[in-house]
């Protein structure tokens, strides 16, 4: 009779994560008589992924009954498949021996491959704020797939990015990998309400790639600027003066009225307007009593915005001549209770 | 559900012999090997041997050899450990186990006294 | 044959505390055949650690099993009062199989 030969049909089996894989193998005799197992590797480190006759393997099944009579079938399923399952995988028959079985014959071997799908892309920012036409880094992130190959992609409001730098780690072989890119993107003063966007695309994603967004909200600070303009109001001895404060980001923004060098009053914008780039608009307003003043008034408007150094504008109010409207209120709310009189 | 089903307790004299058994249920017995094991009262776990009911081939452990022998009835889906010339060493809990190892019996408790 | 030696032979872990149970081997066993078994009193072992490093069904995620060739371990990252039990290695890698002297572990 022919000696027996073990044949393994497969010489690769490609299977997705999660999936089951099934590892065909026959052999063409009966005799001699023993169990087959199944190893992942070759030589003296192989691993023991099936025993037909003893140990535990809660992940897999045989494909046949092994128990009947002339089963010749020892192809086995292996359940819930992992990228760390990829390898190759001998069938081995072993003949009944003293005081250990002896190896046979095995199988020329059936390599796994795992096709594992890449985690979404975490897109992270810079710690700190920063203003436009600066620089800022983004990173992406992500883990887990197989194969290597992989093709990663930045946008800017749809538009795609060249800035970039990508790796994909180990260099060499693995049971799954994961990708780094950073990109650079420059700040314009119409970027709060833009987003850079990552994009992962993998054979695993059938053409519908994954991606990872940051909002600009949380990465640009615009700073404000400030216009003082004064008009008379009420009595002719009374004068209005607004401090507009135009396209800030974020809100955050505390202001502080001086006069003459001295704190009159401070407050912290709250009803403020949004402009449709995202920006915001305030305007805080002090009436000033100046019948009773000698001396000219410098009245400064300062802000301090986002916990950044303050930034100011002053005016002069002069107090010898007749009250002039210098300049008029361009916004359409006024703020709080202001009102403020100097004797 | 797969069970182990083993003997009641045993009270035998020194000298005798002794015969245990095991009767599996939810699975083919043929499918596994069949290992035996000793606990003595508070002691460790000694592996006896272990049969393939498929052929009767055994193997022992060298302390066990003419001591025990394991024998297997596929019609009965039981596996059987006879054990000889009983002494006082012999008095422990038997357990059979399936070859995958999770499934053990609840235990035969042998006492060998006069 | 292999001899299988466990340390301590008996030890005591308060709760909350981390412990790790030893199994050296007198020759090199491959980490697919070395299992851990618990017992507790009046009881069967149960499996509880295959291959070295798998959790057997139903085992806590507390648990955890590594080595390689000689030196095997199980480590408990916050010892239970449940888990006081004597644990037993075993390999099955070369005949005669072999159970180690086990490792009684008793809560404080």
């Known amino acids: 009779e022919e000696e027996l030969q073990v044949i393994q049909p497969d010489k690769s089996v490609l299977v997705a994560a999660g999936e089951t894989a099934t590892l065909r193998c026959t052999a063409t005799s009966l005799i001699p008589v023993g169990p087959i197992q199944w190893f992942r590797g070759a030589g003296p480190g192989r691993e023991l992924i099936y025993n037909q006759k003893e140990g535990h393997f809660p992940r897999v099944t045989t494909v046949s009954d092994l128990t009947k009579r002339n089963n010749m079938d020892f192809s086995i399923r292996i359940g819930n498949i992992t990228p760390a399952d990829a390898g190759t995988y001998y069938c081995v028959k072993f003949r009944k021996g003293s005081p250990d079985d002896v190896e046979f014959k095995s199988g020329a071997g059936t390599e796994l491959s795992v096709r594992a799908k890449p985690s979404a892309p975490v897109v992270s920012g810079p710690a700190a704020r920063a203003t436009p036409q600066h620089t800022v880094s983004f990173t992406c992130e992500s883990h887990g797939f197989s194969p290597r190959d992989i093709t990663l992609k930045w946008f800017k409001n749809g538009n795609e990015l060249s800035d970039f730098q990508t790796n994909v780690d180990p260099v060499g072989e693995s049971v799954s990998y994961s990708i780094h890119s950073t990109a650079k993107v420059v700040l314009t003063r119409e970027d709060v309400h833009s987003q850079v966007i990552c994009e992962v695309a993998h054979v695993t994603l059938q053409g519908d790639p994954l991606r990872g967004t940051a909002n600009l909200s949380e990465t640009i600070r615009v700073p404000p600027t400030l216009e003082v303009t004064q008009q008379p109001v009420r009595a002719e001895n009374q004068v209005n003066v607004t401090c507009q404060v135009r396209k800030f980001y974020p809100q955050r923004l505390q202001l502080t009225w001086l006069e003459n060098g001295n704190v009159s009053r401070t407050e912290t914008a709250s009803t403020v307007t949004e402009n449709k780039d995202g920006t915001y608009n305030w305007m805080s307003w002090l009436l000033v009593n100046v019948s009773a003043h000698r001396d000219d008034v410098k009245l400064t408007c300062q802000v301090e915005h986002d916990g950044q150094p303050a930034v100011s504008k002053s005016h002069d109010l002069k107090v010898s001549a007749h009250p002039k409207e210098q300049g008029s209120n361009t916004a359409a709310e006024n703020t709080g209770s202001n009102e403020r009189n100097i004797y | 559900e797969v069970q182990l089903q083993q003997s009641g307790v045993e009270v035998v004299q020194p000298g005798a012999s002794v015969k245990l058994s095991c009767t599996a249920s939810?699975?083919?017995?043929?499918?596994?090997?069949m290992h035996w094991v000793k606990q003595r009262t508070e002691q460790g776990l000694e592996w006896i041997g272990r049969?393939?009911?498929?052929?009767?081939?055994?193997k022992y452990a060298p302390k066990f050899q003419g001591k025990a022998t394991m024998t297997a009835d596929t019609s009965s889906s039981t596996a059987y450990l006879q054990l000889s010339s009983l002494t006082s060493d012999d008095t422990a809990v038997y357990y059979c186990?399936?070859?995958?190892?999770?499934?053990w019996g609840q235990g035969t408790t042998l006492t060998v006294s006069s | 044959q292999i001899v299988l030696t466990q340390s301590p032979a008996i030890m005591s872990a308060s709760p909350g505390e981390k412990v790790t149970l030893t199994c050296s081997a007198s020759?090199?066993?491959?980490?697919?055949?070395l299992y851990w078994y618990q017992q507790k009193p009046g009881s069967s072992p149960k499996l509880w650690i295959y291959?070295?490093?798998n959790l057997a069904s139903g085992v806590p995620p507390r648990f955890s099993g590594s080595g390689s060739g000689t030196s095997y371990s199980l480590t408990i990252s916050s010892m239970q009062a449940e888990d006081a039990a004597s644990y037993f290695c075993?390999?099955?890698?070369?005949?005669?199989?072999?159970f180690g002297g086990g490792t009684k572990l008793e809560i404080k």
């Open positions: 049969i393939d009911p498929e052929d009767g081939e055994s």
């Open positions: 939810g699975f083919n017995i043929e499918a596994y090997y």
């Open positions: 020759s090199s066993v491959s980490s697919s055949y």
């Open positions: 075993y390999q099955w890698s070369s005949y005669p199989y072999t």
């Open positions: 291959s070295t490093s």
């Open positions: 186990v399936r070859g995958s190892y999770e499934y």
